[in-house]
């Protein structure tokens, strides 16, 4: 008799896009409409929840822009929270200072991406320093991962 | 008798580098010489043509530079075109405004990378706002993808 | 009799973080403590040593900052060295010029990431133009790869 068909495991992957009704940290994300992907990973209150331990490539891009540059320091962090640990772990971070000409309309992006060993129940979030300066277009601000 | 050797499927992957004879949009790419990769994906008139539906990590970097900064708005887009859809879909985008000191020699990069669910016959392209400000060195300006 | 258990190959992966005792080029990296990963790849004197030919996604981020901007040109390179070739091959590079306001405290990141066909015994390194301007926090400056 022929062997049972190989069960093709679903790839664990997420690509979430900017959601303009984010009011506080961590950033919230669109998990349903547009060019969104969410498979084998859960989305909960701004966070991607890992349900299988392993190696993951995690990435995020944030698009900052303003109308009258004041050069407020900008930061963009991807961090991890797990009930076993008391403190958030900053996995990746980008900072910008003195990035535009005073008074000018300005725009700048921060991109982060790297490989991490994540554990089941880890929650991953994105934080920014100046929420009012983030533009949430789906092509400009996003957060994702995939299991290697 | 021993089982037939497993047929190892070729990884679908591309890494194309800057081509300085780009004259209009979309950007054209070097698909033959240097550190180029092209396997299981076709290159046609500036575009990467998907021939197998699935999840892909897509990335691009563009290196902008100029002799005398006048802060022209810069944009860098990765977009998708498919004959089934009337309009291009912008997958990822980076924008820069007010990024250098007027009159100075300047240089800046834009990097994009994320996961997308692509369909057979999708064509992926890269667009920039100011072609004359792009430097096409193979290490500086590139476009690639791989199937997860 | 049941077939022998499938030997699950260890994923070839590395994620190294900034090491502040770098004194010269190439940059040196933390390969032991913190959010570091090193599996199926060796680390030697600043370099990641490939021990299996194949396709790899290689990435690096460097965080530059200073107390008083004088717009020194910044460069960030990932390059490859192999005893078979006389010269280093620059795989990816980012350059910045005229990026901050003279005299101001400033901060900026450079991110690089792409797919390459690497050969056993290739050594990969990261180079920067201004070592004194690099901040080595593990979340800010890193270097990694994984085999596709």
């Amino acid at each position: 008799p022929s062997p049972p068909p190989e069960k093709k495991e679903l790839r664990k992957v997420a690509h979430l896009t900017g959601k303009s009704n984010s009011r506080s940290m961590p950033l919230e994300w669109e998990d349903t409409y547009g060019i969104v992907l969410l498979s084998g990973v859960k989305y909960k209150k701004g966070g991607l929840v890992i349900n299988e331990t392993g190696l993951y490539f995690v990435y995020s891009k944030v698009y900052f822009r303003g109308q009258s540059c004041n050069n407020l320091p900008l930061s963009h962090k991807v961090y991890m929270r797990n009930s076993k640990y008391p403190q958030d772990l900053v996995m990746m971070e980008g900072k910008m200072m003195s990035y535009c000409t005073t008074g000018q309309m300005w725009a700048r992006s921060s991109y982060l991406g790297a490989v991490f060993n994540l554990t089941s129940a880890d929650h991953l979030y994105v934080n920014v320093s100046e929420l009012s300066l983030v533009n949430f277009e789906e092509s400009q601000t996003f957060f994702g991962l995939y299991k290697l | 008798p021993s089982p037939p050797p497993e047929k190892k499927e070729l990884r679908k992957v591309a890494h194309l580098t800057g081509k300085s004879n780009s004259r209009s949009m979309p950007l054209e790419w070097e698909d033959t010489y240097g550190i180029v990769l092209l396997s299981g994906v076709k290159y046609k008139k500036g575009g990467l043509v998907i021939n197998e539906t699935g999840l892909y990590f897509v990335y691009s970097k563009v290196y902008f530079r100029g002799q005398s900064c006048n802060n022209l708005p810069l944009s860098h887009k990765v977009y998708m075109r498919n004959s089934k859809y009337p309009q291009d879909l912008v997958m990822m985008e980076g924008k820069m405004m007010s990024y250098c000191t007027t009159g100075q020699m300047w240089a800046r990069s834009s990097y994009l990378g994320a996961v997308f669910n692509l369909t057979s016959a999708d064509h992926l392209y890269v667009n920039v706002s100011e072609l004359s400000l792009v430097n096409f060195e193979e290490s500086q300006t590139f476009f690639g993808l791989y199937k997860l | 009799p049941s077939p022998p258990p499938e030997k699950k190959e260890l994923r070839k992966v590395a994620h190294l973080t900034g090491k502040s005792n770098s004194r010269s080029m190439p940059l040196e990296w933390e390969d032991t403590y913190g959010i570091v990963l090193l599996s199926g790849v060796k680390y030697k004197k600043g370099g990641l040593v490939i021990n299996e030919t194949g396709l790899y996604f290689v990435y690096s981020k460097v965080y530059f900052r200073g107390q008083s901007c004088n717009n020194l040109p910044l460069s960030h390179k990932v390059y490859m060295r192999n005893s078979k070739y006389p010269q280093d091959l620059v795989m990816m590079e980012g350059k910045m010029m005229s990026y901050c306001t003279t005299g101001q405290m400033w901060a900026r990141s450079s991110y690089l990431g792409a797919v390459f066909n690497l050969t056993s015994a290739d050594h990969l390194y990261v180079n920067v133009s201004e070592l004194s301007l690099v901040n080595f926090e593990e979340s800010q400056t890193f270097f990694g790869l994984y085999k596709l």
Epitope: Q67, N70, T102, M105 | P73 | -
Partner: antibody, heavy 119, light 111 residues
């Protein structure tokens, strides 16, 4: 509530300098740039320049370059605009106005300071 | 620099009637889907007050009888039913790039 309170009227002789202050309250001072706009008697509005309250550097209208200096004192949430080499045509009401970086326009203005240049 | 031209210089309208003020820019003040055009009201002895930002957005606290429209180089401020407190000078201003420039103003007077 948000307030921008400017210093009082000044009378200056041609060739002299004047320094006008603008004290902010009711909001986070370093979150907004401060712009200066002037209005000659019976005339329209003229943009002079802008200062970063966070970083302290300024961008000026070319017309005033070399004569105008904008400074900030974050400890008192005050911005200053100094105009030198005064001439009679500098007689005007000088306004400061805040501009939120995330918005499109100057949303709150000071009450104005009349500077009269006369020999 | 971008030159802003307002018309008419003076507009005489009766209370309760509609007023339409025009502003033209010497080059487009649009970028990325937004029009960087603002309208201010100024009464004698007072500082300007923001009415409309980004061509058509009503500033908080401004009555709904004020509206703005236009894009590119041509913009309009409309006051649907003039109240006595609306008689003042109105300025358009672009914030597309530095230097910001204002129109010369339109004086709205009682007919």
């Amino acid at each position: 509530q948000v307030q921008l309170v400017q210093s009082g009227a000044e009378v200056k002789k041609p060739g002299a300098s004047v320094k006008v202050s603008c004290k902010a309250s009711g909001y986070t001072f370093t979150d907004y740039t401060i712009h200066w706009v002037r209005q000659a008697p019976g005339q329209g509005l003229e943009w002079m320049g802008v200062i970063s309250t966070y970083q302290g550097d300024a961008s000026y209208n070319q017309k005033f370059k070399g004569r105008v200096t904008m400074t900030v004192d974050t400890s008192t949430s005050t911005v200053y605009m100094e105009l030198s080499s005064l001439r009679s045509e500098d007689t005007a009401v000088y306004y400061c106005a805040r501009f939120p970086d995330w918005d499109y326009a100057m949303d709150y203005w000071g009450q104005g300071t009349l500077v009269t240049v006369s020999s | 620099e971008i030159v802003m031209t307002q018309s008419p210089a003076t507009l005489s309208v009766s209370p309760g009637e509609r007023a339409t003020l025009s502003c033209k820019a010497s080059q487009s003040v649009d970028y990325d889907g937004d029009s960087y055009m603002n309208w201010y009201q100024q009464k004698p002895g007072q500082a300007p007050r923001l009415l409309i930002y980004a061509a058509s957005n009503l500033e908080s606290g401004i009555p709904a009888r004020f509206s703005g429209s236009g894009s590119g180089t041509e913009f309009t401020l409309t006051i649907s039913s003039l109240q006595s407190e609306d008689f003042a000078v109105y300025y358009c201003q672009h914030s597309r790039e530095l230097p910001y420039t204002f129109g010369q103003g339109t004086k709205l007077e009682i007919k």
